[in-house]
């Protein structure tokens, strides 16, 4: 039961995370004009990964796409790439995890296959979340660098009669959405991996070989990878004797105790 809950929750958390990554990638507010002491501005600039926008106090908003690939900074291209990779991996992970969910029955798919799919989707979510966090962090670092550079420029070359209003940019809402979404996707991925570990012992059990001691008709199950190292006896960590003579087929048909932890 706990495995199903962990898997389901991991799926939902990752779904929210990936939706957030998509939202962040599409948002225009990756960087917003720093208003420092003036909360009201006649012209407000903000930029996204795909276009830059200007909102006038008149309410008029104009956005212009970046219609060049070669003319864009390499860092911006890298951030775009990281976010897209994150979305693609996350989307594939979601697709895989749907079929891996314990609560969904698809034909005669074995739990071992579901465990593998759960682990695969979990890893995909982890990588997806890391890509998003990396992308947002790279952009944030770029902003911080540019912010201090433009701040330095504001206080140099002021000797002349004409001053240039230097537009400084600070963190936009998309950065925070991206960080949170990346984190959620990462957490969801970890939960999927934990759920996989809960599923996996049973798979090894099902493939166990029955050892028949002389004069007894008792089946012994060697401990799974979760409970033991796989070497020697396993009396300390896991009860391996079921207390009744059952065949492998019978053992397989009973519900796993891991479902009710």
């Amino acid at each position: 039961m706990a495995v199903t809950a962990c898997q389901g929750l991991g799926f939902v958390v990752s779904l929210i995370g990936i939706a957030g990554i998509i939202a962040a990638t599409c948002m225009d507010q990756w960087s917003t004009q720093d208003l420092y002491n003036n909360p009201v501005t006649a012209v407000f600039n903000y930029q996204g990964l795909w276009r830059s926008c200007v909102r006038e106090s008149s309410g008029f908003t104009e956005c212009r796409g970046y219609f060049t690939l070669l003319g864009l900074p390499a860092m911006l291209q890298a951030v775009r790439a990281l976010m897209i990779v994150g979305i693609v991996l996350g989307a594939i992970g979601l697709l895989v995890s749907i079929f891996a969910l314990k609560c969904i029955r698809i034909g005669s798919m074995e739990d071992s296959a579901k465990a593998n799919m759960t682990l695969t989707s979990g890893i995909m979510f982890i990588v997806s979340g890391l890509c998003a966090i990396a992308g947002v962090s790279v952009f944030a670092n770029m902003l911080v660098t540019n912010f201090w550079m433009s701040t330095a420029n504001m206080y140099t070359g002021m000797g002349g009669m004409v001053q240039t209003v230097q537009t400084r940019y600070t963190f936009g809402a998309a950065l925070f959405v991206g960080w949170v979404a990346g984190g959620l996707t990462l957490i969801g991925g970890v939960m999927m991996c934990i759920a996989c570990r809960g599923l996996a012992p049973e798979e090894t059990n099902y493939k166990a070989v029955s050892y028949h001691a002389s004069g007894h008709s008792v089946a012994y199950k060697p401990g799974g990878f979760k409970a033991s190292t796989g070497f020697g006896s396993n009396t300390k960590n896991k009860k391996i004797y079921d207390g009744g003579a059952r065949t492998e087929d019978e053992v397989q048909s009973y519900p796993s105790k891991h479902d009710y932890v």
Epitope: A42, S52, C53, V54, E56, S57, G59, Q163, V165, T167
Partner: antibody, heavy 118, light 113 residues
């Protein structure tokens, strides 16, 4: 047709207060910032401040903080500017104006002359 | 605050001739975000409120005759009337529309020679 109709001329004594009105018609009142500008005799135009009829938020020129107070009556599509502690230097024509694209004023009231004289 | 200085203070031009009014800003009015210059030109006739002629330094307001044109970028701007008409006699103002507080030039009085 967009129209901004202001209240009539006022003559006030120094230290008194005056409230000028600006009634808007022909457009959605709550969609545009309303600005106030003054023109003293022989002086350049001076921006006083602005108010958004939807949110009621205001922004003033530092020079007019404490001097001008902008309010509105949404139901009557009317903006008001109250000038307090009047002095002879406040003698001017006061305009309300609607802000449009390019942060420019496309429609202006006809102007209200405020004369401060003892 | 941004200071706008117009030149000349007054200008006399013959009918049908070109009239040029300059406006210089103490700070750049060019917005890097959209590469637009936030300078506006107004015409004011005696006893009337100002009338919008040009915004974004060069965009003519609808209904304004095409003999009026605006140019310039950054800190230096020009209003040109290609062929002066009698009805163009007025005072012309430039306005900073880039930062608050909005500021205006001192005005240029245009007369017929």
């Amino acid at each position: 047709e967009v129209q901004l109709v202001q209240s009539g001329a006022e003559v006030k004594k120094p230290g008194a207060s005056v409230k000028v009105s600006c009634k808007a018609s022909g457009y959605t009142f709550t969609s545009y910032w309303m600005h106030w500008v003054r023109q003293a005799p022989g002086q350049r135009l001076e921006w006083i401040g602005m108010i958004h009829p939807n949110s009621g938020s205001t922004n003033y020129n530092e020079k007019f903080k404490g001097k001008a107070t902008l309010t509105l009556d949404k139901s009557a599509s009317t903006a008001y500017m109250e000038l307090s502690s009047l002095r002879s230097e406040d003698t001017a024509v006061y305009y309300c104006a609607r802000l449009k694209t390019g942060n420019s004023f496309d429609y202006w009231g006809q102007g209200t002359t405020v004369t401060v004289s003892s | 605050d941004i200071v706008l200085t117009q030149s000349p203070d007054s200008l006399a031009v013959s009918l049908g001739e070109r009239a040029t009014i300059n406006c210089k800003s103490s700070q750049s009015l060019l917005n890097s975000g959209n590469q637009k210059n936030y300078l506006t030109w107004y015409q004011q006739k005696p006893g009337q409120p100002p009338k919008l002629l040009i915004y974004w330094a060069s965009t003519r307001e609808s209904g304004v005759p095409d003999r009026f044109s605006g140019s310039g970028s950054g800190t230096d701007f020009t209003l040109t009337i290609s062929s002066l008409q009698a009805e163009d006699v007025a005072v012309y103002y430039c306005q900073n529309a880039y930062t608050y507080p909005f500021t205006f030039g001192q005005g240029t009085k245009l007369e017929i020679k």
